[in-house]
Interface confidence: low
Amino acid sequence: QGCGQDKICQSNLQLERYQFCSRISDTEFQALPMDLDGRTALFALSGQPFIGLELTVTNLPSDPSRPQADGDDAHEAQLLVTLPASLRYSGVRALDSVEKPLCLSNDSASHVECELGNPMKRGAQVTFYLILSTSGITIETTELEVKLLLATISEQELDPVSVRAHVFIELPLSISGVATPQQLFFSGEVKGESAMRSERELGRKVKYEVTVSNQGQSLNTLGSANLNIMWPHEIANGKWLLYPMRVELEGGQGPGKRGICSPRPNILQLDVDSRDR
Amino acid sequence: ELGQPEPQEPPEKVEPSTSWWPVSSAEKRNMTLDCPRTAKCVVFSCPLYSFDRAAVLHVWGRLWNSTFLEEYMAVKSLEVIVRANITVKSSIKNLLLRDASTVIPVMVYLDPMAVVVE
Protein backbone atom coordinates (compact mmCIF):
# COMPACT_ATOMS: atom_id res chain seq x y z
CA GLN A 1 0.00 0.00 0.00
CA GLY A 2 1.17 3.55 -0.77
CA CYS A 3 3.71 2.22 -3.27
CA GLY A 4 2.05 3.11 -6.55
CA GLN A 5 0.83 0.76 -9.28
CA ASP A 6 4.21 -0.93 -9.66
CA LYS A 7 4.03 -2.05 -6.01
CA ILE A 8 7.65 -0.90 -5.56
CA CYS A 9 8.06 1.79 -2.93
CA GLN A 10 10.19 4.49 -4.50
CA SER A 11 10.31 7.21 -1.91
CA ASN A 12 11.78 10.69 -2.32
CA LEU A 13 12.92 11.71 1.13
CA GLN A 14 14.61 15.10 1.01
CA LEU A 15 16.21 17.27 3.65
CA GLU A 16 14.50 20.38 2.39
CA ARG A 17 15.97 22.64 5.03
CA TYR A 18 18.72 22.28 7.61
CA GLN A 19 20.14 25.21 9.51
CA PHE A 20 21.52 26.15 12.89
CA CYS A 21 19.38 28.52 14.90
CA SER A 22 19.00 30.06 18.33
CA ARG A 23 15.93 29.70 20.49
CA ILE A 24 13.84 32.80 21.13
CA SER A 25 11.11 31.06 23.13
CA ASP A 26 9.51 27.63 23.47
CA THR A 27 8.16 27.73 19.95
CA GLU A 28 10.25 30.39 18.23
CA PHE A 29 13.64 29.83 16.69
CA GLN A 30 15.80 32.23 14.71
CA ALA A 31 18.31 31.20 12.05
CA LEU A 32 21.92 32.08 12.83
CA PRO A 33 23.53 34.60 10.48
CA MET A 34 25.44 33.11 7.58
CA ASP A 35 29.06 33.54 6.57
CA LEU A 36 29.85 35.14 3.21
CA ASP A 37 29.79 31.72 1.54
CA GLY A 38 26.06 31.51 2.30
CA ARG A 39 26.43 27.93 3.51
CA THR A 40 28.18 28.22 6.87
CA ALA A 41 26.43 29.65 9.91
CA LEU A 42 28.16 32.01 12.33
CA PHE A 43 27.85 31.03 15.95
CA ALA A 44 29.05 33.58 18.50
CA LEU A 45 29.64 31.76 21.75
CA SER A 46 28.69 34.23 24.45
CA GLY A 47 26.74 32.29 27.00
CA GLN A 48 23.97 30.48 25.08
CA PRO A 49 23.75 27.02 26.63
CA PHE A 50 22.12 25.45 23.58
CA ILE A 51 21.94 25.74 19.83
CA GLY A 52 19.01 24.57 17.73
CA LEU A 53 19.18 22.66 14.45
CA GLU A 54 16.11 23.25 12.31
CA LEU A 55 15.26 20.33 10.03
CA THR A 56 12.56 19.98 7.42
CA VAL A 57 12.09 16.57 5.76
CA THR A 58 9.70 16.05 2.86
CA ASN A 59 8.53 13.04 0.87
CA LEU A 60 7.16 14.54 -2.36
CA PRO A 61 7.37 13.50 -6.02
CA SER A 62 10.58 14.89 -7.53
CA ASP A 63 8.72 15.74 -10.74
CA PRO A 64 5.14 16.91 -10.20
CA SER A 65 4.36 16.10 -13.83
CA ARG A 66 5.33 12.44 -13.22
CA PRO A 67 4.08 11.86 -9.67
CA GLN A 68 4.04 8.09 -10.14
CA ALA A 69 7.85 7.96 -10.56
CA ASP A 70 8.69 8.46 -6.90
CA GLY A 71 7.47 10.03 -3.68
CA ASP A 72 5.90 6.76 -2.53
CA ASP A 73 5.57 5.97 1.18
CA ALA A 74 8.98 5.80 2.88
CA HIS A 75 8.99 2.79 5.17
CA GLU A 76 11.03 2.98 8.38
CA ALA A 77 11.97 6.55 7.53
CA GLN A 78 14.69 7.82 9.82
CA LEU A 79 17.10 10.70 10.16
CA LEU A 80 20.50 9.68 11.50
CA VAL A 81 22.45 12.50 13.12
CA THR A 82 26.15 12.41 14.00
CA LEU A 83 27.30 15.17 16.32
CA PRO A 84 30.83 16.49 16.92
CA ALA A 85 32.39 16.08 20.36
CA SER A 86 31.57 19.73 21.11
CA LEU A 87 27.78 19.21 20.83
CA ARG A 88 25.49 16.87 22.72
CA TYR A 89 21.89 15.96 21.96
CA SER A 90 19.52 17.40 24.53
CA GLY A 91 16.04 17.04 23.08
CA VAL A 92 13.68 17.72 20.22
CA ARG A 93 11.08 20.41 19.71
CA ALA A 94 8.45 20.92 17.05
CA LEU A 95 6.20 23.88 16.40
CA ASP A 96 3.36 21.40 16.09
CA SER A 97 3.72 18.65 18.70
CA VAL A 98 1.65 16.30 16.50
CA GLU A 99 4.48 16.07 13.98
CA LYS A 100 7.32 15.86 16.51
CA PRO A 101 9.41 12.80 15.72
CA LEU A 102 10.69 10.42 18.35
CA CYS A 103 14.44 10.95 18.67
CA LEU A 104 16.71 8.70 20.69
CA SER A 105 20.40 9.16 21.37
CA ASN A 106 23.23 6.88 22.44
CA ASP A 107 24.75 7.13 25.93
CA SER A 108 27.24 9.83 24.98
CA ALA A 109 24.51 11.80 23.15
CA SER A 110 26.75 11.94 20.05
CA HIS A 111 24.47 9.95 17.74
CA VAL A 112 20.75 10.53 17.36
CA GLU A 113 18.13 8.54 15.49
CA CYS A 114 14.86 10.29 14.72
CA GLU A 115 11.90 8.20 13.63
CA LEU A 116 10.09 10.13 10.87
CA GLY A 117 7.33 7.61 10.38
CA ASN A 118 6.71 4.04 9.39
CA PRO A 119 5.84 4.84 6.77
CA MET A 120 6.46 8.50 6.17
CA LYS A 121 3.50 8.98 3.88
CA ARG A 122 3.52 10.25 0.35
CA GLY A 123 3.23 14.07 0.38
CA ALA A 124 4.32 14.34 4.04
CA GLN A 125 6.42 17.19 5.38
CA VAL A 126 7.81 17.48 8.91
CA THR A 127 9.73 20.35 10.54
CA PHE A 128 11.41 19.95 13.91
CA TYR A 129 14.31 21.28 15.93
CA LEU A 130 17.06 19.29 17.55
CA ILE A 131 18.23 20.99 20.74
CA LEU A 132 21.97 20.59 21.12
CA SER A 133 23.94 21.44 24.25
CA THR A 134 26.95 23.69 23.61
CA SER A 135 28.62 22.81 26.92
CA GLY A 136 31.34 20.89 25.07
CA ILE A 137 32.41 23.90 23.03
CA THR A 138 35.79 25.11 24.25
CA ILE A 139 37.78 28.19 23.31
CA GLU A 140 39.67 25.99 20.85
CA THR A 141 36.50 25.02 18.94
CA THR A 142 36.50 26.81 15.61
CA GLU A 143 33.89 24.82 13.69
CA LEU A 144 30.79 22.76 14.30
CA GLU A 145 29.86 20.06 11.82
CA VAL A 146 26.75 17.92 12.13
CA LYS A 147 26.31 15.03 9.69
CA LEU A 148 22.78 14.17 8.61
CA LEU A 149 21.66 11.05 6.78
CA LEU A 150 18.12 10.15 5.81
CA ALA A 151 17.38 6.42 5.73
CA THR A 152 14.50 4.23 4.56
CA ILE A 153 13.97 0.61 3.50
CA SER A 154 12.01 1.91 0.52
CA GLU A 155 13.91 2.23 -2.75
CA GLN A 156 15.95 5.45 -2.72
CA GLU A 157 19.58 6.49 -2.97
CA LEU A 158 20.40 8.74 -0.02
CA ASP A 159 23.59 10.71 0.57
CA PRO A 160 24.76 12.32 3.81
CA VAL A 161 24.80 16.09 4.15
CA SER A 162 26.71 18.28 6.59
CA VAL A 163 25.59 21.39 8.42
CA ARG A 164 28.45 23.66 9.40
CA ALA A 165 28.96 26.66 11.62
CA HIS A 166 32.03 28.76 12.35
CA VAL A 167 32.43 29.36 16.08
CA PHE A 168 33.53 32.71 17.38
CA ILE A 169 34.29 33.32 21.02
CA GLU A 170 32.72 36.71 21.51
CA LEU A 171 34.35 38.50 24.40
CA PRO A 172 31.60 40.44 26.12
CA LEU A 173 33.83 43.39 26.96
CA SER A 174 32.73 46.99 26.75
CA ILE A 175 34.76 50.12 27.29
CA SER A 176 33.72 53.66 28.10
CA GLY A 177 35.55 56.79 29.15
CA VAL A 178 34.98 60.19 30.66
CA ALA A 179 37.15 63.25 31.24
CA THR A 180 36.79 65.63 34.18
CA PRO A 181 36.42 68.47 33.44
CA GLN A 182 35.30 68.26 29.83
CA GLN A 183 36.28 71.88 29.16
CA LEU A 184 39.71 73.28 29.97
CA PHE A 185 41.18 76.75 29.73
CA PHE A 186 44.76 77.88 29.18
CA SER A 187 46.30 81.11 30.38
CA GLY A 188 49.38 82.47 32.12
CA GLU A 189 52.90 82.92 30.81
CA VAL A 190 55.17 81.02 28.50
CA LYS A 191 57.73 79.05 30.45
CA GLY A 192 60.42 76.66 29.20
CA GLU A 193 60.45 72.95 30.02
CA SER A 194 63.70 73.21 31.98
CA ALA A 195 62.16 75.82 34.27
CA MET A 196 59.31 73.51 35.33
CA ARG A 197 59.61 72.13 38.85
CA SER A 198 56.05 71.30 39.90
CA GLU A 199 53.01 70.04 38.05
CA ARG A 200 51.09 73.14 39.21
CA GLU A 201 53.30 75.27 36.98
CA LEU A 202 52.18 73.41 33.85
CA GLY A 203 48.51 74.28 33.42
CA ARG A 204 45.02 73.06 34.24
CA LYS A 205 44.49 69.58 35.59
CA VAL A 206 42.40 66.95 33.78
CA LYS A 207 41.48 63.44 34.88
CA TYR A 208 40.48 60.62 32.53
CA GLU A 209 38.60 57.59 33.74
CA VAL A 210 38.30 54.57 31.42
CA THR A 211 36.04 51.72 32.54
CA VAL A 212 36.14 48.22 31.07
CA SER A 213 33.21 45.96 31.90
CA ASN A 214 33.23 42.21 31.42
CA GLN A 215 29.80 40.57 31.25
CA GLY A 216 31.22 37.13 30.59
CA GLN A 217 33.55 34.55 32.06
CA SER A 218 36.71 35.55 33.88
CA LEU A 219 39.26 36.61 31.29
CA ASN A 220 42.28 34.80 32.63
CA THR A 221 41.21 31.74 30.63
CA LEU A 222 41.39 33.57 27.33
CA GLY A 223 44.96 34.83 27.14
CA SER A 224 46.22 38.21 28.20
CA ALA A 225 44.16 41.36 27.77
CA ASN A 226 45.53 44.88 27.81
CA LEU A 227 43.80 48.17 28.40
CA ASN A 228 45.54 50.84 26.35
CA ILE A 229 45.15 54.60 26.41
CA MET A 230 46.50 56.66 23.49
CA TRP A 231 47.67 59.79 25.23
CA PRO A 232 48.39 62.85 23.04
CA HIS A 233 51.53 64.06 24.78
CA GLU A 234 53.02 66.18 21.99
CA ILE A 235 51.91 68.28 19.06
CA ALA A 236 53.39 67.72 15.61
CA ASN A 237 56.46 69.91 16.24
CA GLY A 238 57.40 68.03 19.41
CA LYS A 239 56.12 70.51 22.00
CA TRP A 240 54.27 69.17 25.04
CA LEU A 241 50.47 69.00 24.76
CA LEU A 242 49.03 66.96 27.62
CA TYR A 243 51.56 66.06 30.27
CA PRO A 244 50.84 62.67 31.92
CA MET A 245 51.30 62.87 35.70
CA ARG A 246 49.82 59.67 37.08
CA VAL A 247 48.38 56.41 35.68
CA GLU A 248 46.58 54.01 37.96
CA LEU A 249 44.62 50.82 37.20
CA GLU A 250 41.99 49.67 39.64
CA GLY A 251 40.73 46.11 39.22
CA GLY A 252 41.74 43.62 36.58
CA GLN A 253 44.53 42.18 38.72
CA GLY A 254 42.72 39.91 41.14
CA PRO A 255 41.38 40.86 44.57
CA GLY A 256 42.85 44.02 46.09
CA LYS A 257 45.81 44.38 43.70
CA ARG A 258 46.62 47.54 41.79
CA GLY A 259 47.72 47.31 38.20
CA ILE A 260 51.07 48.38 36.78
CA CYS A 261 50.92 50.28 33.50
CA SER A 262 53.82 51.10 31.22
CA PRO A 263 55.59 53.30 30.37
CA ARG A 264 55.79 55.30 33.58
CA PRO A 265 54.20 58.75 33.47
CA ASN A 266 55.72 62.01 34.78
CA ILE A 267 59.02 61.45 32.99
CA LEU A 268 60.22 64.93 34.00
CA GLN A 269 59.68 63.89 37.63
CA LEU A 270 57.83 67.06 38.48
CA ASP A 271 56.63 67.55 42.03
CA VAL A 272 53.13 66.22 42.49
CA ASP A 273 50.48 68.70 43.61
CA SER A 274 50.23 68.21 47.38
CA ARG A 275 46.48 67.77 47.06
CA ASP A 276 47.07 64.67 44.93
CA ARG A 277 49.58 62.97 47.21
CA GLU B 1 45.89 40.21 18.18
CA LEU B 2 42.64 42.07 18.47
CA GLY B 3 41.78 45.73 18.66
CA GLN B 4 45.35 46.90 18.14
CA PRO B 5 45.84 50.62 17.48
CA GLU B 6 46.35 51.34 13.80
CA PRO B 7 49.98 51.77 12.73
CA GLN B 8 51.04 55.35 13.32
CA GLU B 9 51.41 57.27 10.08
CA PRO B 10 53.76 60.25 9.96
CA PRO B 11 52.00 63.23 11.51
CA GLU B 12 50.57 65.84 9.22
CA LYS B 13 52.50 69.08 9.58
CA VAL B 14 50.30 71.61 11.32
CA GLU B 15 51.53 75.16 11.01
CA PRO B 16 51.93 76.66 14.47
CA SER B 17 50.43 80.11 14.69
CA THR B 18 53.37 81.66 16.58
CA SER B 19 51.34 84.88 16.59
CA TRP B 20 50.09 85.31 20.11
CA TRP B 21 48.44 88.69 19.66
CA PRO B 22 44.67 88.79 19.67
CA VAL B 23 42.80 87.86 16.50
CA SER B 24 39.15 88.77 15.92
CA SER B 25 36.87 85.83 16.73
CA ALA B 26 35.48 85.88 13.19
CA GLU B 27 38.93 84.90 11.89
CA LYS B 28 39.51 82.26 14.55
CA ARG B 29 39.10 78.62 13.64
CA ASN B 30 38.39 75.35 15.43
CA MET B 31 41.04 72.65 15.56
CA THR B 32 41.28 69.03 16.60
CA LEU B 33 44.39 67.49 18.09
CA ASP B 34 44.24 63.76 17.53
CA CYS B 35 46.81 61.01 17.00
CA PRO B 36 48.37 60.22 14.66
CA ARG B 37 47.53 63.09 12.33
CA THR B 38 47.74 66.26 14.38
CA ALA B 39 49.37 65.04 17.57
CA LYS B 40 51.82 62.38 18.74
CA CYS B 41 50.68 59.79 21.25
CA VAL B 42 52.34 57.73 23.89
CA VAL B 43 50.44 54.52 24.58
CA PHE B 44 50.03 53.59 28.23
CA SER B 45 49.35 49.88 28.37
CA CYS B 46 47.93 48.10 31.42
CA PRO B 47 47.74 44.30 31.51
CA LEU B 48 44.46 42.86 32.78
CA TYR B 49 45.40 39.60 34.47
CA SER B 50 42.49 38.21 36.44
CA PHE B 51 39.73 40.24 34.87
CA ASP B 52 36.39 39.40 36.40
CA ARG B 53 33.75 42.14 36.29
CA ALA B 54 35.26 45.61 35.79
CA ALA B 55 38.51 47.53 35.71
CA VAL B 56 38.94 51.30 35.85
CA LEU B 57 41.96 53.15 34.52
CA HIS B 58 42.56 56.59 36.05
CA VAL B 59 44.95 58.96 34.27
CA TRP B 60 45.76 62.40 35.63
CA GLY B 61 47.34 64.96 33.35
CA ARG B 62 47.99 68.66 32.91
CA LEU B 63 47.61 70.94 29.93
CA TRP B 64 51.00 72.31 28.95
CA ASN B 65 50.06 75.99 29.05
CA SER B 66 53.14 77.29 27.28
CA THR B 67 52.47 75.24 24.13
CA PHE B 68 48.91 76.51 23.90
CA LEU B 69 50.03 80.13 24.43
CA GLU B 70 52.74 79.83 21.80
CA GLU B 71 50.89 77.79 19.20
CA TYR B 72 47.14 78.15 19.52
CA MET B 73 46.33 81.72 20.50
CA ALA B 74 44.68 82.25 17.12
CA VAL B 75 42.45 79.22 17.53
CA LYS B 76 38.83 79.58 18.63
CA SER B 77 38.59 76.14 20.21
CA LEU B 78 40.74 73.06 20.41
CA GLU B 79 39.38 69.56 20.69
CA VAL B 80 41.93 67.24 22.28
CA ILE B 81 41.20 63.57 21.68
CA VAL B 82 42.24 60.72 23.96
CA ARG B 83 41.52 57.20 22.75
CA ALA B 84 41.37 53.96 24.71
CA ASN B 85 41.01 50.37 23.61
CA ILE B 86 41.26 46.78 24.75
CA THR B 87 43.58 44.36 23.02
CA VAL B 88 43.77 40.63 23.57
CA LYS B 89 46.86 38.64 22.73
CA SER B 90 45.84 35.06 22.30
CA SER B 91 46.68 31.93 20.38
CA ILE B 92 42.94 31.54 19.85
CA LYS B 93 42.22 32.53 16.28
CA ASN B 94 38.46 32.89 16.62
CA LEU B 95 38.20 35.54 19.31
CA LEU B 96 35.83 38.34 18.49
CA LEU B 97 35.99 41.65 20.31
CA ARG B 98 33.21 44.18 19.78
CA ASP B 99 32.89 47.69 21.26
CA ALA B 100 36.54 47.48 22.26
CA SER B 101 37.46 51.14 21.85
CA THR B 102 36.30 54.52 23.03
CA VAL B 103 37.06 58.17 22.27
CA ILE B 104 37.21 60.83 24.99
CA PRO B 105 37.21 64.41 23.73
CA VAL B 106 38.08 67.47 25.82
CA MET B 107 37.53 71.06 24.64
CA VAL B 108 40.30 73.59 25.31
CA TYR B 109 39.85 77.37 25.10
CA LEU B 110 41.87 80.45 25.90
CA ASP B 111 40.75 81.60 29.32
CA PRO B 112 38.62 84.69 28.59
CA MET B 113 39.86 86.22 31.86
CA ALA B 114 43.50 85.60 31.00
CA VAL B 115 46.12 88.30 30.82
CA VAL B 116 48.65 86.87 28.43
CA VAL B 117 52.28 87.57 29.23
CA GLU B 118 55.05 86.58 26.86
Epitope: R23, I24, S25, D26, E28, S46, G47, Q48, P49, F50, S90, G91, S97, K100, I131, P172, Q215 | -
Partner: antibody, heavy 117, light 106 residues
Protein backbone atom coordinates in the same frame (compact mmCIF):
# COMPACT_ATOMS: atom_id res chain seq x y z
CA UNK C 1 27.85 30.98 40.17
CA UNK C 2 24.26 31.28 38.98
CA UNK C 3 21.98 33.06 41.47
CA UNK C 4 18.54 34.68 41.49
CA UNK C 5 17.25 36.88 44.29
CA UNK C 6 13.71 38.18 44.68
CA UNK C 7 12.94 41.44 46.47
CA UNK C 8 9.53 42.95 47.13
CA UNK C 9 7.53 45.16 49.46
CA UNK C 10 6.41 42.33 51.75
CA UNK C 11 3.08 44.03 52.43
CA UNK C 12 0.81 45.50 49.78
CA UNK C 13 -2.68 47.03 49.89
CA UNK C 14 -5.43 45.83 47.50
CA UNK C 15 -5.60 49.33 46.01
CA UNK C 16 -1.93 49.21 45.05
CA UNK C 17 -0.18 47.08 42.49
CA UNK C 18 2.23 44.36 43.57
CA UNK C 19 5.77 44.76 42.23
CA UNK C 20 8.60 42.28 42.73
CA UNK C 21 12.13 42.42 41.33
CA UNK C 22 14.31 39.42 40.53
CA UNK C 23 18.03 40.27 40.37
CA UNK C 24 20.17 37.66 38.66
CA UNK C 25 23.91 37.03 38.59
CA UNK C 26 26.17 34.48 36.95
CA UNK C 27 24.29 34.54 33.65
CA UNK C 28 22.90 37.03 31.17
CA UNK C 29 19.23 37.81 30.62
CA UNK C 30 20.02 38.04 26.91
CA UNK C 31 20.72 34.28 26.92
CA UNK C 32 18.13 32.85 29.32
CA UNK C 33 14.44 33.27 30.07
CA UNK C 34 13.15 33.87 33.61
CA UNK C 35 9.89 32.46 35.01
CA UNK C 36 7.77 33.57 37.96
CA UNK C 37 6.18 30.97 40.24
CA UNK C 38 4.25 31.40 43.49
CA UNK C 39 3.16 29.22 46.40
CA UNK C 40 0.24 30.30 48.59
CA UNK C 41 0.49 29.16 52.26
CA UNK C 42 -0.26 25.42 52.57
CA UNK C 43 -0.75 25.03 48.80
CA UNK C 44 1.27 23.90 45.79
CA UNK C 45 3.35 25.74 43.21
CA UNK C 46 1.62 27.84 40.55
CA UNK C 47 3.32 29.06 37.37
CA UNK C 48 2.65 32.75 36.68
CA UNK C 49 4.55 33.58 33.52
CA UNK C 50 7.86 33.91 31.71
CA UNK C 51 9.96 36.54 29.96
CA UNK C 52 12.22 35.00 27.31
CA UNK C 53 15.75 36.11 26.45
CA UNK C 54 14.42 38.10 23.50
CA UNK C 55 11.79 39.88 25.62
CA UNK C 56 8.75 37.84 24.56
CA UNK C 57 6.34 37.16 27.45
CA UNK C 58 3.86 34.33 28.11
CA UNK C 59 1.43 34.31 31.04
CA UNK C 60 -0.78 31.89 32.97
CA UNK C 61 -4.14 32.40 31.21
CA UNK C 62 -6.01 32.67 34.55
CA UNK C 63 -3.88 35.65 35.59
CA UNK C 64 -3.04 37.20 32.24
CA UNK C 65 -5.27 40.27 32.64
CA UNK C 66 -3.54 41.30 35.90
CA UNK C 67 0.07 40.34 35.24
CA UNK C 68 2.90 42.01 33.45
CA UNK C 69 6.54 40.88 33.29
CA UNK C 70 9.38 43.09 32.07
CA UNK C 71 13.15 43.26 32.44
CA UNK C 72 16.25 45.42 32.25
CA UNK C 73 19.05 43.35 30.68
CA UNK C 74 21.78 45.85 31.58
CA UNK C 75 20.84 45.75 35.28
CA UNK C 76 20.22 41.98 35.22
CA UNK C 77 16.74 42.52 36.67
CA UNK C 78 13.33 41.02 35.90
CA UNK C 79 10.15 42.65 37.16
CA UNK C 80 6.76 41.16 38.03
CA UNK C 81 3.80 43.52 38.35
CA UNK C 82 0.33 42.39 39.44
CA UNK C 83 -2.64 44.74 39.49
CA UNK C 84 -5.44 44.67 42.09
CA UNK C 85 -3.87 42.12 44.45
CA UNK C 86 -6.33 40.17 46.62
CA UNK C 87 -5.92 37.94 49.66
CA UNK C 88 -5.75 35.01 47.19
CA UNK C 89 -2.46 36.48 46.01
CA UNK C 90 -0.80 36.09 49.42
CA UNK C 91 2.08 33.73 48.67
CA UNK C 92 5.79 33.12 48.48
CA UNK C 93 6.89 34.42 45.05
CA UNK C 94 9.84 32.82 43.28
CA UNK C 95 11.76 33.62 40.12
CA UNK C 96 13.48 30.76 38.31
CA UNK C 97 15.81 30.52 35.34
CA UNK C 98 14.55 28.72 32.27
CA UNK C 99 16.89 25.82 31.60
CA UNK C 100 16.55 26.45 27.87
CA UNK C 101 15.13 23.00 27.50
CA UNK C 102 12.03 24.29 29.28
CA UNK C 103 12.45 23.25 32.90
CA UNK C 104 13.47 25.64 35.69
CA UNK C 105 17.05 24.76 36.54
CA UNK C 106 17.89 27.40 39.19
CA UNK C 107 15.50 29.13 41.60
CA UNK C 108 15.64 32.11 43.92
CA UNK C 109 14.91 31.64 47.63
CA UNK C 110 11.59 33.48 47.28
CA UNK C 111 10.01 36.60 48.76
CA UNK C 112 6.85 36.65 50.88
CA UNK C 113 3.97 38.89 49.85
CA UNK C 114 1.04 39.73 52.13
CA UNK C 115 -2.04 41.60 50.93
CA UNK C 116 -3.82 43.63 53.58
CA UNK C 117 -5.80 46.82 53.75
CA UNK D 1 -4.29 24.75 29.42
CA UNK D 2 -2.71 21.42 30.33
CA UNK D 3 -3.68 20.07 33.77
CA UNK D 4 -1.35 17.86 35.81
CA UNK D 5 -2.85 15.43 38.35
CA UNK D 6 -0.26 14.28 40.87
CA UNK D 7 -0.80 11.42 43.31
CA UNK D 8 -0.64 10.67 46.12
CA UNK D 9 -0.81 14.06 47.86
CA UNK D 10 1.16 12.65 50.77
CA UNK D 11 2.93 9.42 51.63
CA UNK D 12 5.00 7.90 54.39
CA UNK D 13 7.81 5.40 53.90
CA UNK D 14 10.65 3.77 55.81
CA UNK D 15 14.33 4.66 55.60
CA UNK D 16 15.98 2.50 52.95
CA UNK D 17 12.63 1.91 51.27
CA UNK D 18 11.28 3.01 47.89
CA UNK D 19 8.47 5.39 46.93
CA UNK D 20 6.81 6.16 43.61
CA UNK D 21 4.84 9.27 42.68
CA UNK D 22 2.76 9.57 39.52
CA UNK D 23 1.62 12.48 37.39
CA UNK D 24 -1.07 12.29 34.72
CA UNK D 25 -1.37 15.03 32.11
CA UNK D 26 -4.66 16.08 30.53
CA UNK D 27 -3.03 15.56 27.10
CA UNK D 28 0.14 14.09 25.58
CA UNK D 29 3.10 16.16 26.86
CA UNK D 30 5.76 14.48 24.70
CA UNK D 31 7.99 13.57 27.67
CA UNK D 32 8.36 17.23 28.63
CA UNK D 33 8.12 16.66 32.37
CA UNK D 34 10.49 17.64 35.18
CA UNK D 35 10.51 16.69 38.86
CA UNK D 36 11.39 19.01 41.73
CA UNK D 37 12.20 18.64 45.41
CA UNK D 38 10.97 21.48 47.64
CA UNK D 39 12.03 22.00 51.25
CA UNK D 40 10.63 24.75 53.52
CA UNK D 41 12.43 28.09 53.30
CA UNK D 42 14.27 27.19 50.10
CA UNK D 43 13.63 27.42 46.39
CA UNK D 44 12.68 24.16 44.65
CA UNK D 45 15.52 22.00 43.33
CA UNK D 46 15.48 20.40 39.90
CA UNK D 47 16.06 16.64 40.08
CA UNK D 48 15.02 15.27 36.69
CA UNK D 49 14.13 16.81 33.33
CA UNK D 50 12.82 15.37 30.07
CA UNK D 51 11.12 12.48 31.92
CA UNK D 52 14.25 10.59 32.97
CA UNK D 53 17.39 12.74 32.62
CA UNK D 54 19.07 13.30 36.00
CA UNK D 55 20.46 16.76 36.69
CA UNK D 56 24.23 16.80 37.37
CA UNK D 57 24.94 16.03 41.02
CA UNK D 58 21.61 14.28 41.66
CA UNK D 59 22.09 10.71 43.01
CA UNK D 60 20.92 7.79 40.90
CA UNK D 61 18.49 6.82 43.68
CA UNK D 62 16.14 9.25 41.91
CA UNK D 63 14.61 8.07 38.64
CA UNK D 64 11.80 8.94 36.27
CA UNK D 65 9.92 7.25 33.45
CA UNK D 66 6.81 7.53 31.31
CA UNK D 67 5.46 8.76 27.99
CA UNK D 68 2.31 10.22 26.48
CA UNK D 69 0.11 11.32 29.39
CA UNK D 70 1.44 9.07 32.19
CA UNK D 71 4.65 9.65 34.12
CA UNK D 72 6.20 8.37 37.33
CA UNK D 73 9.02 9.36 39.65
CA UNK D 74 10.75 7.06 42.15
CA UNK D 75 13.16 7.38 45.04
CA UNK D 76 14.88 4.24 46.28
CA UNK D 77 17.05 3.73 49.39
CA UNK D 78 15.29 6.57 51.20
CA UNK D 79 17.45 8.73 53.46
CA UNK D 80 16.36 11.41 55.97
CA UNK D 81 17.35 14.24 53.59
CA UNK D 82 14.63 13.07 51.17
CA UNK D 83 11.93 14.48 53.45
CA UNK D 84 10.37 17.19 51.28
CA UNK D 85 7.47 17.96 48.97
CA UNK D 86 7.91 16.75 45.38
CA UNK D 87 6.32 18.36 42.31
CA UNK D 88 6.04 17.44 38.67
CA UNK D 89 6.12 20.18 36.02
CA UNK D 90 4.97 19.88 32.42
CA UNK D 91 6.72 22.20 29.98
CA UNK D 92 5.41 20.98 26.66
CA UNK D 93 3.01 23.90 26.41
CA UNK D 94 3.49 26.84 28.76
CA UNK D 95 4.04 25.42 32.26
CA UNK D 96 1.86 23.58 34.80
CA UNK D 97 2.79 22.04 38.15
CA UNK D 98 1.21 18.99 39.71
CA UNK D 99 -0.40 19.47 43.12
CA UNK D 100 2.63 18.14 45.02
CA UNK D 101 3.38 15.08 47.15
CA UNK D 102 4.52 15.48 50.74
CA UNK D 103 6.98 12.73 51.67
CA UNK D 104 7.42 11.75 55.31
CA UNK D 105 9.62 9.08 56.84
CA UNK D 106 8.00 6.54 59.18
Amino acid sequence: QVQLKESGPGLVAPSQSLSITCTVSGFSLTSYGVHWVRQPPGKGLEWLGVIWAGGITHYNSALMSRLSISKDNSKSQVFLKMNSPQTDDIAMYYCARDGYYGDFDVWGAGTTVTVSS
Amino acid sequence: DIQMTQSPSSLSASLGGKVTITCKASQDINKYIAWYQHKPGKGPRLLIHYTSTLQPGIPSRFSGSGSGRDYSFSISNLVPEDIATYYCLQYDNLRTFGGGTKLEIK
